[in-house]
């Protein structure tokens, strides 16, 4: 399966000396049946390659059954003895080469896992002699060494040294966690992105790190415009402020009253609160119409009745809806200089003998100066 | 070669459920995620949801939020999409996509999709 | 939810035309949108991705631009392959929308 992997444990070979060219059994590489207590291995050199068995750990290794966690091996590395490059820039790239299928460190043995790496392992390491005619047997085993430990992962390489029964073997190892996957098990995946599905990089434990307008565990929720109501508003992209049915204003804090609410306001969406003095579903009723039109005229007393209605409470001598009209306006007699007086709905009206004018007939008409008041007159006066 | 093969569709009555899977091969299938969308007879393209193989994160369209499930197992490459209280408006092709995206960019695309596997809803 | 509006719904082009399909978004997406192609009977096809990146084996006479809300996909020179439906897609944020298409049809 496509599964790809979670991390990396990388053995890089250092050196190995295999001072007299013999294989673990005893016999020479060269198989012509001699062997170092036989006056030593000198024809024909081992042509030496390794392979590397990970495994769950164990206390007491067995050397058989299955690699669980992992096998890799490298090409013919040298003869009897030789010495590679260390482990360091050299191996990160090789490894970088290796996971994108170029050319890799022959030293280095790489095996990826995919499953959360355990800490503990063990590690077998087979030194074996390259035979053209045949394929691997326990007879071409050069040496077989084995270590049981504990490894987090990192980038810092750990160093081993094995004496064997007839090579020795120095190596180094290291635990890595694929790019995307964190922590000491390298099992927690984050692979920074900027689309709908999340808007974050990764901090180095692998936790998600919202990018700048974005919130949230997946970073998937815009954080809108500093102040914009989240009860009635929200974002789908940073920095708005769209508010819900029923609200409005820049950040969606301010409700929107019953539609043609004239004197009123809301603190639900779609309410009409009347101001003080005002009625009706629409607040267009005026509760107090004598406070602000004040009708009533010739000290009429204003009293508020139904909405948008009043009375006026007429003085002794008024009447009319706004006491508007005098009572017997003509009983004080109040035309001078002769004038006739005549009630009408207004109150009364004075007819003027010629020469008088004014409401009352007290002003005197002269021919040159105009209107001055004197003891007789001619006109009459409307009032 | 990618490849994304969908099955499990046929005939429904309203009310039922079905499942419908996307097998996935010629990728990592955790490096990516895996998106279902569906195309009415005669309509356009309509996201149903998706999952993040890697860490179960799943998210879904508000049309089939809380009827549908999005599932994965990394084991079999395999996506899967649980379909429960299914209704006529349901009826559709559903289509199962990869989805590629890269930080150094804003966006993403759906750039592997399956063949598609009909669903109909109805009595 | 962000609405992605294409147009035209359809349009009749010759081979060898030069053909502009738009599409708006409701709000900004930034650059997060996608372009697909789709035959009868076929599965979608990504041709942008990212508004103006040219996917992967597409043809390059297929183009896009735009940032924001307004986006265009351009075809320089229409080849009778290229008869099919267009659709939009903004991946800014959840949930991804689709336009509603537009079919290119030989005129």
């Known amino acids: 399966a496509d599964l790809g992997s979670m991390g990396y444990f990388e053995l890089q070979l250092s050196a190995l000396r295999n001072v007299n060219g013999e294989l673990l059994s005893g016999a020479c590489c060269d198989g012509d049946g001699r062997t170092t207590r036989a006056g030593g291995c000198g024809r024909d050199e081992c042509d030496t390659y390794v392979r590397v068995c990970l495994k769950e750990y164990q206390a007491k290794v067995t050397p058989t059954g299955p690699c669980s966690y992992g096998y890799g091996a490298t090409p013919v590395l040298g003869g009897n003895s030789f010495y590679l490059p260390p482990a360091g820039a050299a191996g990160d790239r090789a490894r970088a080469r290796s996971r994108t299928g170029g050319h890799q460190d022959p030293g280095l043995v790489v095996i990826p896992f995919q499953f959360a790496w355990p800490r503990s392992f063990t590690l077998i390491v087979e030194a074996w002699d390259w035979d053209n005619d045949t394929t691997p047997d326990e007879e071409l085993l050069i040496e077989r060494v084995s270590h049981a430990g504990m490894i987090n992962p990192e980038d810092r390489w750990k160093s081993l040294h094995f004496s064997g029964h007839v090579a020795h073997l120095e190596l180094q190892i290291r635990v890595r966690c694929d790019e995307n996957y964190y922590s000491a098990t390298c099992n927690k995946f984050c692979r920074p992105r900027n689309d709908f599905f999340g808007h974050y990089t990764c901090d180095q434990y692998g936790n998600k790190a919202c990018m700048d307008g974005w919130m949230g565990k997946e970073c998937k929720e815009a954080v809108c415009k500093q102040g914009c109501n989240l009860l009635h508003g929200g974002c789908t992209v940073p920095g708005e402020c769209r508010c819900s049915y029923g609200w409005q204003g820049k950040f969606c804090d301010e409700c929107v009253p019953y539609p043609g609410c004239v004197h009123g306001s809301c603190v639900e969406p779609w309410h009409c609160d009347c101001e003080t003095n005002w009625g009706g579903l629409l607040c267009d009723k005026d509760l107090n119409y004598c406070g602000s039109h004040h009708p009533c005229v010739n000290g009429g007393t204003c009293i508020n009745a139904e909405p948008d209605q009043y009375l006026c409470a007429c003085p002794d001598g008024y009447l009319g809806k706004n006491c508007e009209r005098a009572e017997h306006a003509c009983a004080s007699n109040p035309c001078a200089n002769g004038g006739s007086c005549h009630e009408v709905p207004s109150g009364f009206e004075c007819h003027c003998p010629s020469g008088w004018n004014g409401p009352t007939c007290a002003l005197d008409i002269d021919e040159e100066f105009g209107l001055v008041p004197r003891g007789s007159g001619h006109h009459h006066h409307h009032h | 070669e990618v490849q994304l093969v969908e099955s499990g569709g046929g005939l429904v009555q309203p009310g039922g459920s079905l499942r419908l899977s996307c097998a996935a091969s010629g990728f990592t299938f955790t490096s990516y995620d895996i998106h279902w969308v569906r195309q009415a007879p005669g309509k356009g393209l309509e996201w149903v949801g998706g999952i993040s193989p890697a860490d179960g994160d799943t998210d879904y369209a508000n049309s089939v939020k809380g009827r549908f499930t999005i599932s994965a197992d990394t084991s079999k490459n395999t996506a899967y999409l649980q379909m429960n209280s299914l209704r006529a408006e349901d009826t559709a092709v559903y289509y199962c996509?990869?989805?590629?995206?890269?930080?150094?960019?804003?966006?993403?695309?759906?750039?592997?999709w399956g063949q598609g596997t009909l669903v109909t809803v109805s009595s | 939810d962000i609405q992605m509006t294409q147009s035209p719904s359809s349009l009749s082009a010759s081979v060898g035309d030069r053909v502009t399909i738009t599409c708006r978004a409701s709000?900004?997406?930034?650059?997060?949108v996608a372009w697909y192609q789709q035959k009868p009977g076929k599965a979608p096809k990504l041709l942008i991705y990212s508004a103006s990146f040219l996917y992967s084996g597409v043809p390059s006479r297929f183009s896009g631009s735009g940032s924001g809300t307004d986006f265009t996909l351009t075809i320089s020179s229409l080849q009778p392959e290229d008869f099919a439906t267009y659709y939009c897609?903004?991946?800014?944020?959840?949930?991804?929308?689709f336009g509603q298409g537009t079919k290119v049809e030989i005129k």
């Open positions: 897609q903004q991946s800014y944020t959840t949930p991804p929308t």
């Open positions: 709000q900004d997406v930034s650059t997060a």
């Open positions: 996509a990869r989805n590629d995206y890269d930080v150094r960019s804003v966006g993403s695309g759906m750039d592997y």
